[in-house]
Interface confidence: medium
């Protein structure tokens, strides 16, 4: 069962910058994957962006670069201009779709103790799978 | 301008063969999957099959599967749907329609769709 | 597959009148779409992702809903909303239809 994971981290040098890493594993070529923050994408959760393998990305803010690490997996940097962090507590979650054979979504967050620079395992936690 | 613009239907005998075509024009149709999707007398409508934008992936629902088959000549801008083994039930509109990748792949443009009559 | 209810089958509502239709689904879906079909056109586009508007249509359509429970709803009805419309979903194939709501103007 193909499955995704999600990552989370904060930048060592910037403590009001975040990193979000998510990657999909299984078979299949990817045609799209949705990164939302608050929840998963259509169940209360905000777009922050949204990228097409040949098509490009399209962002939101507070997400500041989205884009591709490999074929399966992507990374997207968040500038937090608040001084209190709210997305140390927040969930983020990537929703990668083949289409149309369906689409696959996992939610994760920032280690409540996590040191600034390192990341959490990539622990996959299914939301929605297709059927 | 997008257009898609079907042809290709008519009458045939429960049995026969019909390949249909959807020219397309006014976008970079290699780049988008399509979909042919029909719509009965009672005005339901059902996809009937799906084609990735190379070509190489297609899709179809238990009710088509082994009797329709999508075909795609990216060089002629042209989508294709050879269906045999026809039934009365296969009698419908059938359109063609464009997948857009950033509306999450939903049918944003649609021909204006061509008949099918099975019947002997 | 997944099996798409709509209600009402038809409905009629008087122009300015706010007019809301559902779509209930056999099991949870990932992306929800919703067409308009007027007699003798093909099938047009209206909300994509549950709840965002194609280009150019008006903003008195709204989309909203999770899960296996959605909903279309017009805040004003005008005379040329009368139309049949459809949700749509795509979570695995096959993509399916609902039967539709037919919205006439009383």
């Known amino acids: 069962t193909p499955e995704v994971w999600v990552q989370v981290q904060m930048e060592a040098t910037e403590l009001s910058s975040f990193t979000v890493h998510c990657g999909f594993l299984g078979p299949g070529s990817i045609s799209l994957v949705t990164v939302s923050w608050g929840g998963p994408d259509g169940a209360g959760g905000t777009k922050l962006a949204v990228l097409h393998p040949e098509l490009g990305t399209r962002q939101w803010a507070p997400a500041r670069q989205a884009r591709w690490e490999t074929q399966s997996s992507i990374s997207l940097a968040l500038e937090d201009s608040g001084a209190s962090s709210p997305f140390a507590n927040t969930t983020f979650c990537c929703k990668f779709a083949s289409f149309p054979e369906g689409s696959w979504e996992s939610c994760g967050s920032l280690p409540p103790s996590s040191d600034p620079g390192l990341s959490a395992p990539p622990t996959p936690v299914p939301i929605l799978r297709a059927d | 301008e997008v257009q898609l613009v079907e042809s290709g239907g008519g009458l045939v005998k429960p049995g026969g063969s019909l390949k249909l075509s959807c020219a397309a024009s006014g976008f970079t149709f290699s780049s988008f999957a399509m979909s042919w999707v029909r719509q009965t007398p009672a005005k339901r409508l059902e996809s009937v099959a799906t084609?990735?934008?190379?070509?190489?992936?297609?899709y179809y629902p238990d009710t088509v599967k082994g009797r329709f088959t999508v075909s795609r000549d990216n060089a002629k801008n042209t989508l294709y749907l050879q269906m045999s083994s026809l039934r009365s039930e296969d009698t419908a509109m059938y359109y063609c329609?464009?997948?857009?990748?950033?509306?999450?792949?939903?049918?944003?443009?649609w021909g204006q769709g061509t008949s099918v009559t099975v019947s002997s | 597959q997944i099996v798409l209810t709509q209600s009402p089958a038809i409905m009629s509502a008087s122009p300015g009148e706010k007019v809301t239709m559902t779509c209930s689904a056999s099991s949870s879906v990932s992306y929800m779409y919703w067409y308009q079909q007027k007699p003798g056109s093909s099938p047009r586009l209206l909300i994509y992702?549950?709840?965002n508007l194609a280009s150019g249509v008006p903003v008195r359509f709204s989309g909203s809903g999770s899960g296996t429970s959605y909903s279309l709803t017009i805040s004003r009805m005008e005379a040329e909303d009368a139309a049949t419309y459809y949700c749509q979903q795509w979570t695995s194939y096959p993509l399916t239809f609902g039967a539709g709501t037919k919205l006439e103007l009383k």
């Open positions: 329609a464009r997948h857009d990748d950033f509306l999450y792949y939903a049918m944003d443009y």
């Open positions: 084609i990735n934008n190379g070509g190489i992936n297609t």
């Open positions: 992702d549950t709840s």
